[in-house]
């Protein structure tokens, strides 16, 4: 059996509004006073096992003590009333849990949604946290009939237990109640049909058109409450590799439909589509997006010819020469399909021409020393591109006109080239480049630029600290002009090694030092200057700076019969590198001099 408590705390279930004051009282039973020889002045109040300061406690009479708390902020406090029996033994009399919080705010932003195939779900903003157990009840009624209450589990939403009835207005509101108060939201009045969120369209399919390479036809199935609702659509698409969606103008898809033709697309390009729907009045909610579906536009003939160039090999005897025609595969955006082959036509005169069908990107032909015209077209299954035309002049013709003010410079991790055009109208420019090396041949890459371009960057994969030989050739209707070349670096570094110095001639008071240029593979940049450091075993180190065009230097004012240590360093814009140390000894006497 339970022992009777020695007294009670009132109120027994205290709930306090945060920030307010609160007073509790402890009343001791008469029998308890006599048993323990105590009165209310023996009471010790505790919160969470810590004694309450005396100034908060008031002894009302021999049986009753009160405690007052100001500005209550803790969410939950264990409050106990205890007595000191026999002077020092603390005995618990009674305990309560004191809760603090707020009365519920008036719920706001009440909205309801009817997910197709499910019951109505309403959501609201409960306002500030109450820190107390608060019941939220969704109420709904017709003008003449109440619906079952919906008890919210989470306090922010509730799904009603009944199926919605369409085309009849319903009134909905929320009641919030806790120990500190009760409040109702504003009510909302609506027809559930205007709150429908349809299921996403499905069976989205994409088909292309052989007639038009710029369109794709979409078809899909919409539900719309089993055909009860007319739905309008929202269509978005993107290319397969893009991350941002392109919007089909909503005004184009306003009328109820289950198919649509998307226009102005690029040929032979894979597009991804998605679609969603909403009641055609625009009331309610957009469905979730459908599953994505993709399709590829039909091929179109290539939109431009490939970049086209040639290289001439030395002539075999004098009767004919070998010419290597080279071109670049078209990017997908210009190929507009799978390139099947290339048609090359070489014409010597009106009566002499030869046609080749080539699957690769080069063709070597043998030509006499006459002038030829080469044309090149790319072909896919739809048709041929326009032709790129190159005039291959006779080797006896000297190329006139070249670009001027040719410059190259690195910027934004790219190697830029710029020039001033020649004074004669240009058809196009050819840029060629390769890595200069003493260990490997200069393997050229190249690119073509339009006649209007006079600044571009090299579009290959360039390496840092490699010396690039860059050549720019203007091409005219009559053939190539003169070529201009320069050297450039994408990014310089300090040289891989410094110069190896040696003595060319040593005199009593001077020495001629000589060195070889650092091989281009080790330069890692433009060698701007050299420094020569020299010292004796006991003397101070001397340093002289030498221009990079020199390969020898004379040290003067040297001491005779002295060992010198010399070292050279080479510097690029990015730093220097020392070569090995070299020693030499000056003679005691000059030549012909006697002691």
């Amino acid at each position: 059996q339970l022992l009777e408590p020695c007294g009670y705390i009132y109120p027994e279930f205290p709930v306090v509004q945060r920030g307010s004051n609160f007073t509790a009282i402890c009343v001791l039973k008469e029998a308890c006073l006599q048993h323990y020889y105590v009165n209310a002045s023996y009471i010790v109040w505790k919160t969470n096992h810590a004694a309450v300061p005396r100034e908060q406690v008031t002894v009302i009479n021999r049986t009753t003590s009160s405690v007052t708390f100001t500005d209550v902020v803790l969410p939950s406090v264990q409050l106990t009333c205890n007595i000191l029996s026999f002077g020092q033994i603390e005995q618990n009399v009674y305990g309560v849990t004191m809760l603090s919080g707020f009365p519920p705010d008036k719920p706001t932003n009440l909205t309801c949604i009817v997910n197709e195939g499910k019951n109505m779900l309403c959501q609201w903003d409960p306002g500030r946290e109450t820190y107390l157990e608060t019941n939220y009840t969704l109420k709904s009624e017709w003008a003449t009939e109440k619906f079952p209450d919906c008890q919210s589990k989470h306090g922010t939403s509730c799904m009603v237990s009944y199926m919605p009835t369409y085309y009849v207005n319903i009134e909905v509101w929320v009641e919030a109640e806790n120990a500190l108060g009760k409040v109702s939201s504003e009510s909302i009045n609506f027809d559930p049909v205007d709150k429908v969120k349809p299921t996403p369209p499905y069976n989205l399919s994409v088909t292309n058109s052989e007639e038009l390479s710029s369109i794709l036809k979409l078809s899909w199935v919409s539900s719309g409450l089993g055909g009860l609702l007319d739905l309008k659509s929202d269509i978005q698409y993107r290319t397969k590799d893009a991350s941002t969606w392109i919007q089909v103008p909503l005004e184009d898809t306003m009328s109820p439909r289950t198919s649509f033709t998307v226009q102005d697309l690029k040929p032979f390009t894979e597009y991804v589509f998605r679609i969603r729907s909403i009641k055609d009045s625009g009331k309610g909610y957009w469905s979730d997006w459908s599953e994505e579906a993709s399709g590829t536009t039909y091929e179109d003939r290539p939109s431009r010819p490939p970049s086209f160039w040639y290289k001439t090999n030395p002539s075999h005897g004098q009767e004919y020469r070998s010419v290597r025609l080279i071109w670049k595969a078209l990017p997908l955006s210009e190929a507009n399909g799978k390139i099947l082959d290339y048609e090359v036509i070489l014409t010597q005169s009106k009566s002499v021409s030869q046609t080749y069908t080539v699957t690769g990107t080069e063709l070597t032909v043998n030509l006499t020393n006459d002038r030829y015209v080469a044309s090149l077209a790319a072909r896919n299954k739809v048709g041929k591109s326009a032709a790129a035309v190159l005039t291959i002049p006779s080797p006896h013709v000297t190329a006139a006109y070249s670009v001027v003010n040719l410059k190259a410079f690195p910027k934004d991790n790219l190697l830029w080239v710029e020039w001033t055009p020649p004074p004669k109208p240009v058809s196009k420019y050819i840029l060629e480049w390769c890595v200069l090396s003493e260990n490997a041949p200069c393997v050229e890459d190249w690119q073509q630029e339009d006649a209007t371009v006079n600044r571009t960057h090299l579009r290959g994969r360039l390496l840092e600290s490699k010396c690039y030989q860059i050549t720019v050739t203007p091409v005219f209707a009559t053939g190539p002009g003169g070529s201009e070349s320069l050297k450039a670096y994408l990014k310089q570094a300090a040289p891989a090694r410094g110069p190896t110095v040696r003595t060319k001639k040593v005199g009593k008071n001077e020495a001629v030092l000589a060195w070889d240029q650092i091989p281009v593979d080790d330069q890692n940049g433009f060698i701007r200057n050299y420094s020569i450091s020299y010292r004796t075993s006991v003397g101070k180190e001397m340093v002289v700076h030498v221009d990079s065009s020199h390969t020898e230097y004379t040290l003067s004012s040297l001491s005779s019969d002295t060992l010198y240590m010399v070292r050279m360093a080479a510097y690029t814009d990015e730093g220097g590198k020392d070569g090995p140390e070299f020693t030499f000894t000056t003679p005691k006497f000059a030549q012909g001099e006697i002691e």
Epitope: S349, S351, Y356, V365, L367
Partner: nanobody, 125 residues
Framework: QVQLQESGGGSVQAGGSLRLSCVIS????????MGWFRQVLGKEREGVAA????????VYADSVKGRFTISQDSSKNTVYLEMNGLKLEDTGMYYC??????????????????WGQGTQVTVSS
């Protein structure tokens, strides 16, 4: 690799006829034109006749005009030289040749890159 194989040579009486054949193989792109050349011991190789593989244009040495005819069968990759009214001076080694040089049909031997092994033609009285 490119190969040219001649056949059809032999001995014939003056005024007689022979038909030489040349089968070509190994070309990535067909030659621009093909020719027949002959060489008499101790003399330079001379052009006899040539034909374009595309349009069939022909050219002949003055010494054989009206007597020799060059023709081709593209489907068989074969070039023929029909020789009528053979003379003693037509005796020699006959070579088939091919070129990829793009120019007008010619019997300039310096324009030809590929040669056969030759077939002997002997005309006797």
């Amino acid at each position: 690799q490119v190969q040219l194989q001649e056949s059809g040579g032999g001995s014939v009486q003056a005024g007689g006829s022979l038909r030489l054949s040349c089968v070509i193989s190994g070309f990535t792109y067909r030659p621009t034109f093909m020719g027949w050349f002959r060489q008499v011991l101790g003399k330079e190789r001379e052009g006899v006749a040539a034909i374009t593989t595309g349009g069939g244009s022909t050219v002949y040495a003055d010494s054989v005009k009206g007597r020799f005819t060059i023709s081709q069968d593209s489907s068989k990759n074969t070039v023929y030289l029909e020789m009528n009214g053979l003379k003693l001076e037509d005796t020699g080694m006959y070579y088939c040749a091919a070129t990829t040089v793009i120019t007008s049909v010619s019997i300039n031997r310096n324009l030809y890159q590929y040669w056969g092994q030759g077939t002997q033609v002997t005309v006797s009285s």
